[in-house]
Every structure is written in C-alpha cells, then in structure tokens.
C-alpha cells in the first residue's frame, strides 16, 4: 500500500513511514503552489480588490470540529458565505483550519517578507455552482477555491472569540475524533472589519495534497493576535496519532516557488 | 518567587565541547519558552536560540545553528545548552531567560554562566 | 533582522538630573519593543515592556514611549544605583534583536 502523506516533524517523530513535502504526489510538484513568501513591495496595487461581503459569518453556531491527523479542522457546511473582494462569484464556507508550530515565528505557512507567523488560519471556501464566467473556465478553473488566510502572532490578551475552539481541543486529541464547539461565530475568529481591508492575492494551490491548482489565495496584512497559552494549546493538547505519542505541531509546508505569478494587494 | 539558577563557570580547552545548566523555580516550567543569550566581555548581547521546554522544540538563531544545542529535562525543570568546538569566540557569558510572553521581553534572568575557552 | 540602534553610547549625569535613552528600530515595530538595566557583573533586569508599559517592582521613576521606530527609555531622576548599561530590544520579528546598550555614569 502507498505512504500515507505526512509532514516532516511526523516522519522523523515516527515509526510509520509517510511521504514528507518533498515526496507528495498528485500535483504537488506543479509550479503553481503554495504557500509561498509575500515580498510586500512587489505587490501591485489592484483597484479591484475592493471589500469582502460575509454572509452568515455573524451568525451564532455550535460548531462541529475534528482532529483530522493533520490539523484541527471546522466543518462550515455552507453555513456561510463570502463576495466582493475582487472576487469573480460568491463561495460558500467549507471548513476552517490552522497550521502552527510550538515556537513562535515558524507556525505559519504564507510569510511576508520573509517573516512566518506563531499560526496561520485558513477559511476554505468552493465556489457557487454555475458561476463560472466561460466553458474553459467551468471546466478547468483556477478559482474554485477561495482560502482566506489569517497569520495569528502572539498579544497580551486572551481573545475571547478563539476560546470555543481553544476549550474545545481537549475533547479531539487523536485524529478521527470530533466534539461540538461551544455556540460562536465565525466573525468572532476574524480581526475587526477595518483590518480587513488590506491584503494580498494569488493564484495557486491547497498546500496539502493533492495540492490541486485552482485556489484564489487572499492573505491579509493585519494578524489576528492570541494569547501565548491558547497558541501552545494547539501543540500541547492534539496528536498526529492514536497513541498520543506525537504531538500535532509543524504542520507546515514548506515555501514553494512563486515563478512566472504576481502578487497584487488591495 | 520565579528564578533561574544557572551553572557555574567553566574553564575548558579549544575544541572541547560543554554543557551548562538552568535550573528553573516558581513557575509551571513547561508554559514558559527557555532563551539563551551570549554576552562577550564589554560587548552587548546576542540572542543564540529558543526551547519550549514543554515540546522539546528548538528554535536558533541561524549563528548558532551548528555551534549550540538547546535541551530540557521536564522532570527537574532544567534546561541545557551545549557548545561544541570551543574556540576562543565562544568565552563570554551565557544566560538563559523566561520569555514573558510569546515571542516577546525576557522578563526573569539567570545569573550567567562564564565560560573561558584556554589552552 | 531588524537592525536596532542606540544613542548615546555613554550618557554623563549628575544625580537628581532627568536622562533620556534613545532606541531607533531599521523598520517599524508597532511598540514591540522592552528595555532592560543591567548593573556591572549583574544580568539583565526587565525594567519596560511594550514600549511604555511599566514592570511590577521597577520603580516608577523609570518610563517608556514611542512606537513604530522611534523609543525613549527616561529617568525622571536619576540616583547612583541607576548606575549601569540600558538595552533595548525588538520582538516585533525573528530574530529578536538588542542594541549595543548606553552606558549610564555619573559626572
């Protein structure tokens, strides 16, 4: 049977063996990946990148979220949606997770100039059907996947709106398990409005294989801020394994190649 | 009452290798990351590396990325460093340090340690 | 890195005068910024956090501002035990970086 894939920290953690970044398959190998380093500088100003319209997101729910052996994942079941944004048609919610590490400065997976971040947390959304603007594009589109990305670095300040997710880690150490989350909503995890207005977009891929190329990246400037307890929560409470012998921690795929792509920031 | 108990000074030989201590009291020491910081004599000080003493993850400064090892030992809140291929660069005194918060001040010190690397 | 610099590199003061240390960051760091006292012999004292932000047991006449690249670590008035070389440091982003530090003497 095929190697499961994995990232470095599991292989050199573990018996089992697992395809680590450089060995991932499916079109991992393709030259219009993520993540990738975001030179501030070079990013164009695009006039289209306006604001982001969130549907849904204010909304109080009791979330579902699950161990999945690779991060810590919320099941968002259409329950919200998002437009505007310089983005071509509305996206539905899909699930949320995060990357991290047990230090700061190495959790994230998007850097910016050169700089990573304690966390980074991805909303993943798919396109709404019938959307799409030509038959090329149906077909083939580069821009199925909306994910917007959030790099988290550390405050002073417990943030209140990540406490449901945080608490409810203790429930989900080992993959496959799953637990509802105490009743919040997704604009509680977000950064207020007006820090929303500026980021970076991208086209390239899900960072996790099969690494499928038809992902619109936005990444915003500003940071959420978490306290350093629930940032080492993350690593401290979850596990890769069912034994609980390798705890949950650099889930992060290396940079990739940014080549012949731009960048362009709102 | 938080404190950092470091090991005593050493005199060693060029090439050698050592390990210096921190002992570490009044805290929960696995919720707190462990810093070393150099300092050579009249100079100011340089940040070598981080553990998180809970996880056993190590961070260094790309300086000291083949010259220092970073450990801790959870049983008996202590943290290590180990220097290896002693040169004279490497007398100075070395500290470890609490970080306060997340990737942010140091805000408890260990007295320092003195290392004289001689022949 | 983030390349932090300090002025003066010696501060003369007579006691009871006010002193001001100066810290200029290469890039703008918010108020990720601490200060620290460290006597001759003696390790690191935290005597600021977060630029202006005042530490429990330091005493009050010590105070802190600025933010982006500019900080100012002040005495109101300075006694003999003040004494000692004053360093900043950023970690506003990795690797977190000091400043040659000022040496505060007495005229």
């Known amino acids: 049977a095929e190697s499961h894939w994995c990232y470095e920290v599991q292989a050199e953690s573990s018996n089992y063996p697992c395809l680590v970044p450089v060995k991932w398959g499916g079109n991992c190998q393709k030259d219009r990946q993520s993540p990738i380093n975001i030179v501030t500088t070079k990013a164009k100003v695009d006039k289209k990148l306006g604001r982001f319209f969130f549907s849904g997101y204010d909304k109080k729910q009791t979330w579902t979220v699950q161990n999945n052996g690779h991060s810590v994942m919320m099941l968002l079941e259409n329950k919200a949606s998002i437009s505007g944004g310089g983005l071509p048609a509305p996206y539905q919610a899909k699930q949320l997770h995060l990357h991290w590490s047990d230090l700061p400065y190495k959790g994230s997976e998007h850097s910016l100039d050169g700089e990573h971040f304690a966390m980074e947390m991805h909303i993943v959304h798919e396109k709404e059907k019938g959307t799409s603007r030509n038959v090329k594009e149906a077909q083939d589109p580069e821009d199925e996947i909306a994910v917007l990305a959030f790099l988290v670095e550390a405050g002073t300040q417990v943030n209140e709106g990540f406490q449901p997710l945080v608490e409810a880690l203790s429930n989900i150490p080992k993959p496959e398990m799953s637990t509802t989350m105490a009743e919040s909503s997704l604009l509680d995890l977000l950064p207020k409005e007006e820090k929303l207005r500026h980021y970076f977009r991208y086209l390239g891929s899900l960072t996790t294989p099969t690494c499928d190329e038809k992902v619109v990246w936005t990444v915003f400037r500003e940071p959420i801020q978490l306290h350093r307890e629930q940032i080492l929560a993350f690593s401290q409470k979850l596990y890769y394994d069912k034994e609980q012998t390798v705890s949950m921690k650099d889930n992060v795929r290396p940079l990739q190649q940014l080549g012949q792509r731009t960048v362009i920031k709102s | 009452d938080v404190q950092l108990v470091e090991s005593g000074a050493e005199l060693v030989r060029p090439g050698t290798s050592m390990k210096m201590s921190c002992k570490a009291s009044g805290y929960a020491f696995t919720n707190y990351l462990i810093e070393w910081i150099k300092q050579r004599p009249g100079q100011g000080l340089e940040w070598i590396g981080v553990i998180n003493p809970g996880s056993g993850g190590t961070h260094y400064n790309e300086k000291f990325k083949d010259k220092a090892t970073l450990t801790a030992d959870k049983s008996s809140s202590t943290a290590y460093m180990q220097l290896s291929s002693l040169t004279s660069d490497d007398s100075a005194v070395y500290f470890c340090?609490?970080?306060?918060?997340?990737?942010?001040?140091?805000?408890?010190w260990g007295q320092g340690t003195t290392l004289t690397v001689s022949s | 890195q983030i390349q932090i610099t300090q002025s003066p590199a010696i501060l003369s003061v007579s006691p009871g005068e006010r002193v001001s240390f100066s810290c200029r960051a290469s890039?703008?760091?918010?108020?990720?910024i601490h200060w620290y006292q460290q006597r001759t012999n003696g390790s690191p004292r935290l005597l600021i956090k977060y630029a202006s932000e005042s530490i429990s047991g330091i005493p009050s006449r010590f105070s802190g501002s600025g933010s982006g690249t500019d900080f100012t670590l002040s005495i109101n008035s300075v006694e003999s035990e003040d004494i000692a070389v004053y360093y900043c440091?950023?970690?506003?982003?990795?690797?977190?970086?000091f400043g040659a530090g000022t040496k505060l003497e007495l005229k």
């Open positions: 440091q950023q970690s506003n982003s990795w690797p977190t970086t």
């Open positions: 340090a609490r970080e306060g918060d997340y990737a942010s001040r140091f805000d408890y």
């Open positions: 890039q703008s760091i918010g108020t990720r």
